[in-house]
Interface confidence: low
């Protein structure tokens, strides 16, 4: 069959469905893309105007390609094999209920069934595989494909080279000893410690030197790139995910369904917009969250804030501030404060920096 | 090999409450979801309530919802579930069961079983 | 809720006879169905989940096939220990629901 003889593939979103936010239908279907370039050298880029490769259109009854659609239920969406012209394009029943979640069709599952169609795939015999003809809702926290997927897609564009991971040609891995490099995030989960930074994260266990550098999307494919603040709770392997306003729960290594949730759930003022930094005290049972040059201090056991806040970060931070990138707890009296390619390590019981080093000094640079 | 033993049944006045406890062992019980199902005498099985691995989520059968709360304490592998404001409908024996996942394109299942506890609810 | 119905309630079969007992869903469940058996008296225990997979130590004599909204569990040659009552059940919506339940008995 035909498949796209290129890398670099093109799509645009033509219409939006009305059952969802614009927002919501955007994010499915680039991570039902990314499903896709995650095991394959493929890259896809999403465009707003012009001729691209794949053109996603939601469309109710006769459309203009013969295959009419058939009101709700039954066929929920089509799409044809790579080429010119409609070539690619992935067409969405309307009269479908498009949801986020299980109630209605999953769009984002059914639109990794259509791309699968839509980069050559045809339907698979395995019950278990994404492009077994019958629609199954699954929980899409921990969606991946099957071996039968890969295998099919792998057969058709190779699988993907180390130098060809990133979806996105011009976000390459940052030089881990770069002296200027920065991180969006970092946190303890259990021994290791995640450095998050664009869409990568690196994982420093416990005293060894050896980092090794991960998409985030090869950990948890649901999630986006961009993490911006994260804290851990390991008494309830718990790890806590930020990103704008929406925060993912991570437990056990494993995504929780019914995510992300809007961060004012914690009892955020309507104005914070993003969190910075958190971090989680397991001594007092409290989690610092940084937003600007304010923090607030969030009580897990009783799921309030604290009253009294937010506070100024240069008042209660000796030396820390006015704001700050990421933050971890560790060895039980220190917080590590990141500040562009500068880390400090503050003793909380003493309330001050006890040492000044570069952010990357944990990887031995 | 992988047990559950249920504890805590016994006969209840209506509208009284009662603690049940499921103590596992022969698994990682932190990395699976958890259950509780009943069995009225004589009659068929319902489910009554699911607790996720980490404890942050949990669901409840309709006719349970409100009264009864599953809790789970990983660190001494512990499942319970409080039963308050008990009706005599609630008679049955309660059995505490693992969940597992087969893959991501098929459902939990109970692949282990406590033998389970009576709660009788009786004036 | 999904509901559940099984077909027979009770039935009676002689030793070696082969046994079919059907389970019918009030919507389409896909492949999100899962069989128990329960000896008189003791808990149930997993026999097949996800329409035709054997549990762990699951004689082969069981098997499961189906799909949608009809599914079958078949007993290849009924043994005495076979005796009890079997359940279907889903999981493709919560509350997951059962079978009203099989009664199997030797003739």
């Known amino acids: 069959g035909p498949v796209w003889r290129k890398h670099y593939i093109t799509y645009r979103i033509n219409n939006y469905t009305p059952d969802m936010n614009r927002e919501d239908v955007d994010y499915a279907i680039r991570k039902a893309f990314q499903v896709w370039s995650n095991v394959t050298p493929l890259k896809f880029s999403k465009i707003n105007t012009g001729m691209a490769d794949i053109l996603v259109v939601f469309a109710r009854g006769a459309h203009g390609d013969f295959h009419a659609f058939d009101g709700k239920g039954g066929i929920l969406a089509h799409a044809f094999g790579p080429g010119s012209g409609i070539g690619g394009d992935a067409h969405f029943d309307e009269d479908e209920f498009w949801t986020t979640h299980s109630g209605g069709t999953n769009l984002f599952l059914t639109a990794v069934h259509e791309i699968g169609h839509s980069l050559g795939l045809g339907h698979s015999s395995d019950p278990k595989a994404v492009m077994f003809p019958t629609y199954k809702y699954v929980d899409i926290n921990t969606f991946r494909l099957s071996a039968d997927d890969i295998r099919g897609i792998q057969s058709l564009y190779g699988d993907p080279k180390e130098n060809q991971r990133l979806p996105n040609p011009d976000n390459s891995e940052p030089a881990l000893c770069d002296p200027n490099l920065s991180f969006d995030a970092v946190t303890t989960v259990g021994n290791k410690i995640f450095f998050f930074k664009d869409r990568f994260f690196w994982l420093k266990v416990s005293e060894r030197p050896k980092t090794s550098v991960n998409l985030i999307s090869s950990l948890w494919p649901t999630l986006p790139s961009g993490i911006e603040a994260a804290y851990e709770i390991e008494a309830r392997n718990q790890v806590f995910l930020f990103k704008d306003d929406k925060y993912w729960l991570i437990s056990n290594l494993r995504p929780e369904p019914n995510y992300p949730k809007s961060i004012h759930s914690f009892g955020f003022p309507n104005f914070v917009k993003k969190i910075d930094a958190a971090v989680f005290n397991p001594r007092f049972y409290r989690t610092y969250f940084f937003v600007d040059n304010q923090y607030w201090r969030y009580d897990e056991r009783r799921q309030m804030m604290d009253p009294g806040y937010p506070k100024l970060i240069t008042k209660n931070f000796q030396g820390i501030g006015p704001k700050i990138d990421a933050v971890f707890y560790s060895k039980n009296k220190y917080y590590y404060f990141f500040q562009g390619s500068n880390q400090f390590e503050y003793d909380f019981l003493l309330q001050r920096i006890t040492k000044t080093l570069k952010s990357n000094s944990w990887f031995g640079c | 090999e992988v047990q559950l033993l249920e504890s805590g049944g016994g006969l209840v006045q209506p509208g009284g409450s009662l603690r049940l406890s499921c103590a596992a062992s022969?698994?990682?019980?932190?990395?699976?979801?958890m259950a509780w199902v009943r069995q009225a005498p004589g009659k068929g099985l319902e489910w009554v309530s699911s607790i996720y691995p980490s404890g942050g989520h949990t669901h409840y059968a309709d006719s349970v919802k409100g009264r009864f709360t599953i809790s789970r304490d990983n660190s001494k592998n512990t499942l319970y579930l409080q039963m308050n404001s008990l009706r005599a409908e609630d008679t049955a024996v309660y059995y505490c069961a693992k969940e597992s996942y087969y893959d991501f394109w098929s459902g939990y299942y109970f692949d282990y079983w406590g033998q389970g506890t009576l709660v009788t609810v009786s004036s | 809720d999904i509901q559940m119905t099984q077909s027979p309630s009770s039935l009676s079969a002689s030793v070696r006879d082969r046994v079919t007992i059907t389970c019918r869903t009030s919507?389409?469940?896909?492949?999100?169905l899962n069989w128990y058996y329960q000896a008189p008296g003791r808990a149930p225990k997993l026999l097949i989940f996800g329409v035709s997979s054997l549990h762990r130590g699951v004689s082969s004599r069981f098997s499961g096939s189906g799909d949608g909204t009809e599914f079958t569990l078949t007993i290849s040659s009924l043994q005495p220990e076979d005796i009890g009552t079997y359940f279907c059940?889903?999981?493709?919506?919560?509350?997951?629901?059962f079978g009203q339940g099989t009664k199997v008995e030797i003739k």
């Open positions: 059940q889903q999981s493709y919506s919560s509350p997951w629901t």
């Open positions: 919507q389409n469940i896909n492949t999100y």
């Open positions: 022969g698994f990682t019980f932190s990395e699976y979801q």
